[in-house]
Each structure stands twice: as C-alpha cells, then as structure tokens.
C-alpha cells in the first residue's frame, strides 16, 4: 500500500487550452499544493490519462459539477 | 514554447535495435497532464501511432508493436526514447515524437527523422 | 482497431474553390475525431479537433463536422499554401488510428 503522504504530487505546469468534452471525462481532483507553481483540477479521462485544466475557466467548474452529480446519484 | 526535437542513427542493420530519442526544450517533461508519443510514418504513406509515455513512467504501446517496442522516459535530461528491436525494411519510416495535453490531439511535432533499415 | 477511410485519396481543386474531404470510421466514434495538415517534408499540424474545433491560430476558411461514423473537413476558400496532405485521427480508444491521407493539389 503507497503511503500517501510520501507521494510524488504531480504538478501542472501548463493547462489545455480546449474545451474536453464532458463524456471524455471520468473524474477529477484538485492540485492545491505549495510544491506546485499553480492550482490546477487534474480530470482523469475514459481511458485513464490525465489533462491538466484551469480551475477559473468556466467550462472546468461546469465539468467538476457534472462529476460530483455523477457521484452523487446512486447507481440503479 | 514547448519544441521536440528526435535523434539517433538514420541507418539500422536488419535484425538489429533501432533507438531515438526526443529532447523536449522550453518546457518540462514532468509536467502533469502532457504525453510523450512517438508516431510513423512510412515512405508515401500514411502516418501509425506507436505509443505514449506520461512523465510518472506509464505507457501505452500500439498492439501492432507491442512486443518489440519500448519508450522510455529521463525526467533529468527532459527526454524519452524510443527502442525497436529486430528491425526489418517494413520498419524504414520517418519517425516523429509528438506532444498531448491528455486530450488526444497531437498539437506539438518534432520535425521527424528518417530512420532507413538496410544493410 | 478502429479503421479510418478517407476519400478521396488525391484531388485537384482551383484557388477559391471549396474543397472537401470525408472520413469514415469504422464503428461509431462519437466527435472523438482530429484534422491535421501536413505540408511536404513537414510534421503534420493539430488543425480540428473534437470533430468541429478549430485550433488556436487555425483560420477560419477551415471547419469541420461530423458525428458518429461520417465526418467532413472543408476548406471554404482554397489558398495556394493550402496545397498538403490531410489526415483525420481518431481517438476514441486506444490504439489511436488515422486516415490513410488525402492529397490537396493546385489546378
């Protein structure tokens, strides 16, 4: 088991600069760390890689509430 | 700006290793979120994808190729690499390293090297 | 593996004409659909992406459309430095697969 304090963060040095496509996204989590130069959300696509966004484009936050709403429904 | 540039020898022996690598400049390699692929393209035709490497070690290889090829990351020296064993004419192309933000499109290119298998 | 066939393979067109070029996948890909240019002894260039986005910088005599199976890329008002060979490049799963080309000439 990784201990996850000791875990590298990964850092976004750079954000894409398209707008992904809601279906293409599975999750998300946010960079909020000192060791970064900046804050970013990290999305996980559907076939598990990773795009760095920008936290204050609008088509990120709409994108994070879209996943948490996912989330939140249950599965019947 | 990110820029890519390839290296490594434009003449391989049948049956031998082929080996490049692609120098990433202006920006770095461990950046969360970029992918680094290598991408073919065979003399007049069209271009194959070979596979991708993320900065944290993780690949993806075209089944195509899987068995001979491995892409390699050095985090200190902001490069990755590619390795083609038991090379054969079929694998004479130009071969171009390329970048993408975790979204699919290739938007960054090295200028491409011509690698010909000959002996 | 996803198969991607384009045609034509090669055409002719005059400047100011409109050029287009289809794709055709071989299961449905959704918008999961990239265009590059590629000018001879050149890499290619991101020009679409999502089936329909113009990339930064891309002029806007380019667009592209599509969904599913059948997708187009048109050039509205050919320029002489438009003279390339155009891929498309699908993406919706691994391994990623491309057109087999199509070759732009100047009438």
């Known amino acids: 088991q990784p201990d996850a304090i000791n875990a590298p963060v990964t850092c976004c040095y750079n954000f894409t600069n398209r707008k992904i496509s809601v279906q293409r996204l599975a999750s998300y989590r946010r960079i909020t760390s000192s060791k970064c130069p900046k804050e970013a959300v990290i999305f996980k696509t559907i076939v598990a890689k990773e795009i760095c966004a920008d936290p204050k484009q609008k088509w990120v936050q709409d994108s994070m509430d879209h996943l948490d709403k996912q989330t939140q429904t249950p599965k019947t | 700006q990110v820029q890519l540039q390839e290296s490594g020898p434009g003449l391989v022996k049948p049956s031998q290793t082929l080996s490049l690598t692609c120098t990433v400049s202006?920006?770095?390699?461990?950046?969360?979120?970029?992918?680094w692929n290598w991408i073919r393209q065979h003399p007049g035709k069209g271009l194959e994808w070979i596979g991708y490497?993320?900065?944290?070690?993780?690949?993806y290889y075209n089944p195509s190729l899987k068995s001979r090829i491995t892409i390699s990351i050095d985090t200190s020296k902001n490069q990755f690499s590619l390795t083609l064993s038991s090379v054969t004419a079929a694998d004479t192309a130009v071969y171009y390293c390329?970048?993408?933000?975790?979204?699919?499109?290739?938007?960054?290119w090295g200028q491409g090297t011509m690698v010909t298998v000959s002996s | 593996d996803i198969q991607m066939t384009q045609s034509p393979s090669s055409l002719s067109a005059s400047v100011g004409d409109r050029v287009t070029i289809t794709c055709q996948a071989s299961?449905?890909?959704?918008?999961?659909l990239n265009w590059y240019q590629q000018k001879p002894g050149k890499a290619p260039k991101l020009l679409i992406y999502?089936?329909?986005n113009l990339e930064t910088g891309v002029p806007s005599r380019f667009s592209g459309s599509g969904s599913g199976t059948d997708f187009t890329f048109t050039i509205n008002s050919l320029q002489p430095e438009d003279i390339a060979t155009y891929y498309c490049?699908?993406?919706?799963?691994?391994?990623?697969?491309f057109g087999q080309g199509t070759k732009l000439e100047i009438k």
């Open positions: 490049q699908e993406y919706n799963n691994l391994p990623y697969s």
């Open positions: 999502d089936a329909s």
């Open positions: 202006g920006g770095s390699i461990s950046s969360g979120g970029n992918y």
């Open positions: 490497i993320y900065y944290s070690g993780n690949t």
């Open positions: 390329a970048r993408d933000g975790g979204d699919d499109a290739f938007d960054i």
């Open positions: 299961q449905d890909i959704s918008n999961y």
